[in-house]
C-alpha cells in the first residue's frame, strides 16, 4: 500500500493527477461509521468542506483526496478531520514549464560517483493499475528501453550519464489521458573515496651506517588500494646481490585506506652503497611522490646538520 502523505508542505505541478492520503488510514478502517471530512482553506475562504460536488476534478476515497488533475487554483491549505484526529497540508501548485518536458522546481537531485552503480527506475505505485505506459527521457529526448511499463537504467555510471532524467507515466481516468512526470537531475562526480597518497616522514633522509654492517630502510605511505610503492636504486634494480626489497606490508585504516610499508634491506654495506640515492616512490593515478635515502659513513656524520639524520 502507498504510504501516507506525511510532508506538511507540498509543491506540485499543474495539470497532473495528484492525491493526499492521511496518516490514520488503518484507524479509519476500524471505525467505518466515524464521520470523516476533508476541508480546504485559501485566502479569504475558511474551511470549505470538499466533496465530489465541489469539483468534477476531485474524488474522495477511504483515506485519499484525489485531483484529476490538480490546477493552479487548488493552491491552499487542506485538512482531514476524523473525530479528534486532524491532519493539515499546505499545497502549492506551480505552473508547468511549457517549453520543457519537466518543470525545474520539481526536480530531485542525485549525485553519483563515476564507475559506481547508477540506477533509475520509473515506478508509481499509487497509480500503477491505471498506468498504460511509461517513458523515460534524458534531457527531454526519449530513451529507447525494452520495458515500457517500468523503464529502468542499471549500469556503472560514466560522466556522459549526467543529465535530467524524466519518468513520464501515461494513464487514463474517466476517458481522459493524463501524465505524471518525475524528474531526476543526475550529477556524476569523481570517485570521492580516493586520497592523494602520502609518503610518511621527511623527503630526504641521511642514514648513518658502518661498513660491513646491515641497514633496513623503511618506506611507509598512506595510500589507496590500487596505488603502488616501490624502491628505485642504481642503474638497474637488482644488480646488487646485497640489496633486497622485502615484501610489502599493508594494513587497512579505519577509513578504508591503506597504510603500506616496504623495507629495502642492504647487507654488508660497502663503499659503493655510500652517498648514492635510494628512492622510494608511491605512484597513483594522481601522479608520483618520492622520498630519498642516502647512506653516510658514521665517521662523516659531523659534516651534516643533525636534523637531517634518520636513525
Amino acid at each position: 500500500a502507498e504510504s501516507c502523505t506525511s510532508r506538511p508542505h507540498i509543491t506540485v505541478v499543474e495539470g497532473e493527477p495528484f492525491y493526499l492520503k492521511h496518516c490514520s488510514c488503518s484507524l479509519a478502517h476500524e471505525i467505518e461509521t466515524t464521520t470523516k471530512s476533508w476541508y480546504k482553506s485559501s485566502g479569504s475562504q475558511e474551511h470549505v468542506e470538499l466533496n465530489p460536488r465541489s469539483s468534477s476534478r476531485i474524488a474522495l476515497h477511504d483515506c485519499v483526496l484525489e485531483f484529476w488533475p490538480v490546477e493552479l487554483n487548488d493552491t491552499g491549505s487542506y485538512f482531514f478531520q476524523m473525530k479528534n484526529y486532524t491532519q493539515k497540508w499546505k499545497l502549492n501548485v506551480i505552473r508547468r514549464n511549457k517549453h520543457s518536458c519537466f518543470t525545474e522546481r520539481q526536480v530531485t537531485s542525485k549525485i553519483v560517483e563515476v564507475k559506481k552503480f547508477f540506477q533509475i527506475t520509473c515506478e508509481n505505485s499509487y497509480y500503477q493499475t491505471l498506468v498504460n505506459s511509461t517513458s523515460l527521457y534524458k534531457n527531454c529526448k526519449k530513451l529507447l528501453l525494452e520495458n515500457n511499463k517500468n523503464p529502468t537504467i542499471k549500469k556503472n555510471a560514466e560522466f556522459e550519464d549526467q543529465g535530467y532524467y524524466s519518468c513520464v507515466h501515461f494513464l487514463h481516468h474517466n476517458g481522459k489521458l493524463f501524465n505524471i512526470t518525475k524528474t531526476f537531475n543526475i550529477t556524476i562526480v569523481e570517485d570521492r573515496s580516493n586520497i592523494v597518497p602520502v609518503l610518511l616522514g621527511p623527503k630526504l633522509n641521511h642514514v648513518a651506517v658502518e661498513l660491513g654492517k646491515n641497514v633496513r630502510l623503511n618506506c611507509s605511505a598512506l595510500l589507496n588500494e590500487e596505488d603502488v610503492i616501490y624502491w628505485m636504486f642504481g642503474e638497474e634494480n637488482g644488480s646488487d646481490p646485497n640489496i633486497h626489497e622485502e615484501k610489502e606490508m599493508r594494513i587497512m585504516t579505519p577509513e578504508g585506506k591503506w597504510h603500506a610499508s616496504k623495507v629495502l634491506r642492504i647487507e654488508n654495506i660497502g663503499e659503493s652503497n655510500l652517498n648514492v640515492l635510494y628512492n622510494c616512490t608511491v605512484a597513483s593515478t594522481g601522479g608520483t611522490d618520492t622520498k630519498s635515502f642516502i647512506l653516510v659513513r658514521k665517521a662523516d656524520m659531523a659534516d651534516i646538520p643533525g636534523h637531517v639524520f634518520t636513525r
Epitope: E190, E225, V228, Y230, R250, T285, G286, T288
Partner: antibody
Framework: QVQLVQSGTEVRKPGASVKVSCKAS????????ISWVRQAPGQGLEWMGW????????DYALKLQDRVTMTTDTSTNTAYMELRSLRSDDTAVYYC????????WGRGTLVTVSS | DIVLTQSPDSLAVSLGERATINCRSS????????????LAWYQHKPGQPPKLLIY???TRESGVPDRFSGSGSGTDFTLTISSLQAEDVAVYYC?????????FGQGTKLEIK
C-alpha cells in the same frame, strides 16, 4: 563536461622549441596526473612522461628527459609540455591524457618540424 | 624499462569471427600487494585519440561493447574481440602502468578479411 582541450597545430624549424597546452575541465584537476603521449607518422604510441597535478612531480622518458619540460598551472587547470631542440623526427601528433591508464585524452596537437 | 611485445603485428579476421591479440611484458606487471595487473588496452583509429577499452588487464571501460574482453596475468595478456564488427578496424595497443616509463606495445593492426 569532462574534457582535455589542446592547443592548435604548430610548425617549427629544427633547433626551435614548442610548447603545447592542455586545458582540463569537468573534474578536479589535482586528482589526476597528466601524461603526454606522441605518435610520429606511421609509428606507434610513445609515452613521453607525466606530471603529478597535485605536487608538480615529473617523470620523463629517458630519451627525452634532457629536452622536455612538463608543467601545470592549477589556477587555470592547464598542463603544458615544452620540447626543445626540435628535430625532424619530433614531427608527431602530441596527446595529453589523464591518469596512469588513459580513459580521457585530448584531441591531439600536430607539431611539424621542418626547415 | 618494461618492454611490451605484441603479437601479431597485423591481423585479418572475417566479420563475426573472433580476433585475438597478445601482449607479453618483459617483467611482471602483477602487484602482489593487491593482486592487480597494471595493464591497459587501447583502440586507435586514424584522426582520433586512442580509446581506452580495458584496464587492470580485464576490467572493461564503461561504454565499451562486451564483445571486447581482456585476460591474462603477470607477463602474458590477451585482448579478445568475440565477434568482429566493421567498426573494430583499428590499431590496438597494450600499455603498462606498473612502473614509469609507462610503455606501450608496438601495436597490432586489425583488418577485415
Amino acid at each position: 563536461q569532462v574534457q582535455l582541450v589542446q592547443s592548435g597545430t604548430e610548425v617549427r624549424k629544427p633547433g626551435a622549441s614548442v610548447k603545447v597546452s592542455c586545458k582540463a575541465s569537468g573534474y578536479t584537476f589535482t586528482s589526476y596526473g597528466i601524461s603526454w603521449v606522441r605518435q610520429a607518422p606511421g609509428q606507434g604510441l610513445e609515452w613521453m612522461g607525466w606530471i603529478s597535478a597535485y605536487n608538480g612531480n615529473t617523470d620523463y622518458a629517458l630519451k627525452l628527459q634532457d629536452r622536455v619540460t612538463m608543467t601545470t598551472d592549477t589556477s587555470t587547470n592547464t598542463a603544458y609540455m615544452e620540447l626543445r631542440s626540435l628535430r625532424s623526427d619530433d614531427t608527431a601528433v602530441y596527446y595529453c591524457a589523464r591518469g596512469w591508464y588513459f580513459a580521457l585524452w585530448g584531441r591531439g596537437t600536430l607539431v611539424t618540424v621542418s626547415s | 624499462d618494461i618492454v611490451l611485445t605484441q603479437s601479431p603485428d597485423s591481423l585479418a579476421v572475417s566479420l563475426g569471427e573472433r580476433a585475438t591479440i597478445n601482449c607479453r611484458s618483459s617483467q611482471s606487471v602483477l602487484y602482489s600487494s593487491n593482486n592487480r595487473n597494471y595493464l591497459a588496452w587501447y583502440q586507435h583509429k586514424p584522426g582520433q585519440p586512442p580509446k581506452l577499452l580495458i584496464y587492470w588487464a580485464s576490467t572493461r571501460e564503461s561504454g565499451v561493447p562486451d564483445r571486447f574482453s581482456g585476460s591474462g596475468s603477470g607477463t602474458d595478456f590477451t585482448l579478445t574481440i568475440s565477434s568482429l564488427q566493421a567498426e573494430d578496424v583499428a590499431v590496438y595497443y597494450c600499455q603498462q602502468f606498473y612502473r614509469t616509463p609507462y610503455t606501450f606495445g608496438q601495436g597490432t593492426k586489425l583488418e577485415i578479411k
